[in-house]
Interface confidence: medium
């Protein structure tokens, strides 16, 4: 059947439309297009004769129409008047006629809308505001947006005038937002610029800060007032009813008891004409003396001395308080308070007891703090550490060793090589070392105040060729699915590459395997029984390579769910019952049996001769692995028939 398709159906003014013909019959003589729903010579647009390929304009031809050999009609530069129906009249070679009608609609391209308002400064809880979307356009849909969201559902929001007008009744400060309107028709959509609604409100009841109402003589009084208000409020201060000043802040330096009284803040909004006030009562107290701490030992020795700290001055009927590291006193058997809390004794001080310590005297208003006191605890030296941790160096490099021991006062250091004193410095430096510099390097740390000294010895080997490495492990018996194991390739040597093999193969790619510390450390996370393999590390440098002996990881696992064999569950009376229990476990588990819940023997095999129906019941095998701390069990029902 002959049909007409309009592309597009909705056409914007000034654009073009194609009336596309479908199912055009064969053997045509020609065709004509007409404006309207029927063939009317007065409304012919154009005719076309196929034989001559001649197009002939009709009375309704506007010069904007183009006819194609396939009978489709293109209309350009569309105007509003073009809206409507178009009829195609087809004349076949046998002079039989056929007709089809199509249609399209024309819409204007919408202009960018704007918003007009009937009230630019509405007052909260009093005014209404009506926004209107301009211009008024026929066949247009109007939409509204608040803060780029569609309109919320609210009884205070009302759309009217075909949605062209948005009214906000009884505006609130929360209506201060960005408003946009949008016009839409089938061919265009345009959004307006934002209009910000400026709602006048307040002032709310002012708040005075800080909330503190008690002050000490000699302090500064600094009160600040704030009230939510649009436009911002103007502030006034009154003390005991007497006007002081028109500022947001009230500042009185070095107050005395005479400054006690009622302080009023008044907030005024000139646009809404409203006033609000808030009153606070300020009390000023006389100044007590500032406390201080005395100590019976200014340089106590760690693990030897006790220290008594006393809070001065002594005042009758006063509460004394103490703080360590800005915290209240921790519970500790080494901390003792006297009956009146004025003296704090530290028994057997440690280096962690340095403080700072503060004491306080409590009065009706506040707590007066002393200045902090820090204890100078003498300690150490601890065992010195020599860095770097390398034990192998290649010839020709510089050897630079540094020694450090925790100590107060700081330790004095001495270096010995193979027992011979070298120098009294914290660092030892030897340039361009050779094999002859191999030996025992001792660092001695001495604390002149405590008189204590400690030493650490490190073996240094100077060789271009690396030694046979060994593997150290942080966990010799890890538990499956629980523990991690870190293997470290020893020794630590400069300019050295570290390599690893598992069962003679290079490391597999696995998220549970991680190399760190310059590949010197291999960590296996969440070990499994399959990780019980031979691990080898290798070291190499410019002239040598060497491999460690294998280390086999002993992974503790299980017990898994046991299996009872044989699987038979039905027996004849008089037969022997011989049940064996097995569970995968490392180390081997301990086995025990229960029959109908009653404990039997602690063996892997349960044997009962010449069973009878009395032996019917549930047979449970229990397994436990003392190393992993895990247990497991299985239950089997046995039926004995007579």
């Amino acid at each position: 059947k002959l049909t007409i398709e309009s592309t597009p159906f909705n056409v914007a003014e000034g654009k073009e439309v194609l009336l596309l013909v479908h199912n055009l019959p064969q053997h045509l003589f020609g065709y004509s297009w007409y404006k309207g729903e029927r063939v009317d010579g007065n409304r012919q647009i154009i005719g076309y004769v196929i034989g001559t390929q001649q197009a002939t304009p009709g009375p309704a031809y506007s010069g904007r129409e183009i006819i194609y050999p396939n009978a489709s009609l293109l209309i350009q530069n569309i105007i509003q008047n073009d809206t409507g129906f178009y009829t195609l009249h087809v004349i076949k070679s046998d002079l039989v006629n056929e007709e089809a009608t199509g249609q399209f609609r024309v819409y204007p391209e919408l202009p960018k809308p704007s918003i007009s308002s009937n009230n630019s400064k509405p007052v909260e809880d009093k005014d209404a505001v009506a926004f209107t979307c301009e211009p008024e356009t026929q066949d247009a849909t109007y939409l509204w947006w608040v803060n780029n969201q569609s309109l919320p559902v609210s009884p205070r929001l009302q759309l009217s005038n075909g949605n062209r007008t948005l009214t906000l009744f009884n505006v609130t400060r929360n209506d201060t937002a960005s408003y946009k309107c949008e016009t839409q028709n089938p061919v265009s959509a345009r959004r307006s610029d934002s209009v910000i609604l400026n709602v006048l409100y307040g002032p709310d009841a002012p708040t005075i800060s800080p909330l503190n109402t008690s002050y000490r003589s000699g302090e500064n009084l600094n009160l600040s007032c704030h009230a939510a208000s649009n436009p911002p409020a103007q502030y006034s201060w009154f003390v005991n009813g007497t006007f002081q000043q028109s500022t947001q802040e009230l500042f009185i330096p070095n107050i005395t008891v005479n400054n006690s009284g009622s302080y009023t803040c008044q907030a005024h909004n000139s646009d809404t004409g409203l006033n609000r006030t808030t009153v606070t009562t300020i009390t000023v107290y006389a100044e007590p003396p500032k406390p201080f701490i005395t100590s019976n030992n200014s340089n106590p020795v760690e693990d030897e001395d006790a220290v008594a700290l006393t809070c001065e001055p002594e005042i009758q009927n006063t509460t004394y308080l103490w703080w360590v590291n800005n915290q209240s006193l921790p519970v500790s058997p080494r901390l003792q308070l006297s009956n009146d809390n004025r003296t704090l004794t530290l028994l057997s001080v440690t280096r962690n007891d340095v403080g700072p310590y503060e004491c306080g005297i409590q009065n009706e208003l506040s707590v007066d703090h002393s200045d902090p006191v820090i204890l100078n605890v003498l300690y150490g030296p601890d065992d010195p550490t020599i860095s770097p941790s390398y034990t192998y160096y290649r010839p020709g490099v510089n050897l630079s060793l540094s020694c450090h021991a925790a100590s107060n006062p700081p330790a004095q250091y001495s270096w010995l090589i193979d027992g011979n004193i070298q120098q009294h410095t914290q660092e030892l430096f030897i340039s361009n070392i050779t094999e002859k510099n191999s030996g025992l390097y001792t660092c001695q740390a001495n604390n002149s105040a405590s008189g204590h000294s400690r030493t650490t010895v490190k073996t240094i080997t100077v060789s271009a060729e690396l030694p046979k490495p060994s593997i150290s492990s942080n966990n010799s018996k890890p538990v499956e699915d629980k523990d991690a194991v870190a293997f470290t390739c020893e020794p630590e040597a400069q300019n050295t590459t570290y390599l690893w093999w598992v069962n003679g193969q290079s490391l597999p790619v696995s998220p549970r395997l991680q190399l760190s510390n310059g590949n010197r450390t291999l960590t296996l996370f969440n070990v499994t029984r399959n990780d019980a393999r031979a691990y080898v590390c290798g070291i190499q440098n410019s002239v040598s390579a060497n491999r460690s002996d294998p280390v086999t990881l002993d992974v503790l696992y299980g017990p898994d769910t046991p299996i009872i064999s044989p699987p038979d569950s039905s027996y004849l009376s008089g037969a022997n019952l011989n049940l064996s229990c097995h569970s995968a476990s490392n180390p081997s588990p301990q086995y025990s049996w229960r029959i109908n819940g009653i404990p039997q023997q602690h063996t892997q095999v349960l044997f009962i001769a010449k069973i009878t129906p009395n032996n019917n019941g549930t047979y449970a095998c229990f397994v436990s692995n003392l190393a992993t701390g895990r247990n497991n069990s299985i239950v089997k029902s046995i039926t004995v028939s007579a």
Epitope: R394, P395, G396, T434, E435, S463, A464, E465, P467, K468, L499, W501, V536, G538, Q540, S542, V543, S544, A545, N546, R547
Partner: antibody
């Protein structure tokens, strides 16, 4: 297959300089150290030193300090030995040697050698 | 530098003989390595880290020793073993070689 191909033999005059090449195939020289050695007529092997092609670090035997210079062109996978101020006693076969273990075992690959003859 | 002295400097043996070559170091070393060089050829690694056979080396070759004294042994000499054998130390710079032991087969 690992192979080290050295440049051909040459005759040079005393006081002259020469640059020998060693082209590697079957491995990337950046993963190795390249050693250079020489062997005079009827003499023992002498180690000249090594270069790390990855960063250009070098180690020279004291005897060859100032005489030998190691360089590499990693894009050409080639190592070079420069010899300066040549004297008749520098007449020798010069070898390049990939002397670094790349696994748990030693792998020692040698070039075929280049004969340098110093003669007027 | 660490001087390596090999003995003997040359020897002539029959097929099937057991041969031992000694290498003495002027300073103690943790390991010794052995190379084999046939006339007109490049050296080839024979034994590394004192006693480990390099890839493809027959088991009749073995190495031992410690400190300053090391040795290479061929348990049953074969005609293809005719070559010069060098010991090498890699413990101190410069790396050094022995003077070589030339092995001839009668």
């Amino acid at each position: 297959q690992v192979k080290l191909e050295q440049s051909g033999a040459g005759v040079v005059k005393p006081g002259a300089s020469v640059k020998l090449s060693c082209k590697a195939s079957g491995f990337n020289i950046k993963d190795s150290y390249m050693h250079w050695l020489r062997q005079g007529p009827g003499q023992r092997l002498e180690w000249i030193g090594w270069i790390d092609p990855e960063n250009g670090d070098t180690e020279y035997a004291p005897k060859f300090q100032g005489k030998a210079t190691f360089t590499t062109d990693t894009s050409a996978n080639t190592a070079y030995l420069g010899l300066s101020s040549l004297r008749p006693e520098d007449t020798a076969v010069y070898y390049c040697n990939e002397g670094t273990p790349t696994g748990p075992y030693y792998f020692d690959y040698w070039g075929q050698g280049t004969l340098v003859t110093v003669s007027s | 530098q660490n001087v390596l002295t090999q003995s003997p400097s040359s020897m002539s043996v029959s097929v099937g003989d057991r041969v031992t070559i000694a290498c003495s170091a002027s300073s103690s070393v943790p390991y010794m390595h052995w190379l084999q060089q046939k006339p007109g050829k490049s050296p080839k690694l024979l034994i590394y880290l004192t006693s480990n056979l390099a890839s493809g080396v027959p088991s009749r070759f073995s190495g031992s020793g410690s400190g300053t004294d090391y040795s290479l042994t061929i348990s049953s000499v074969q005609p293809e073993d005719a070559a010069t054998y060098y010991c090498q130390q890699r413990s101190s710079y410069p790396l050094t070689f022995g003077g070589g032991t030339k092995l001839e087969i009668k």
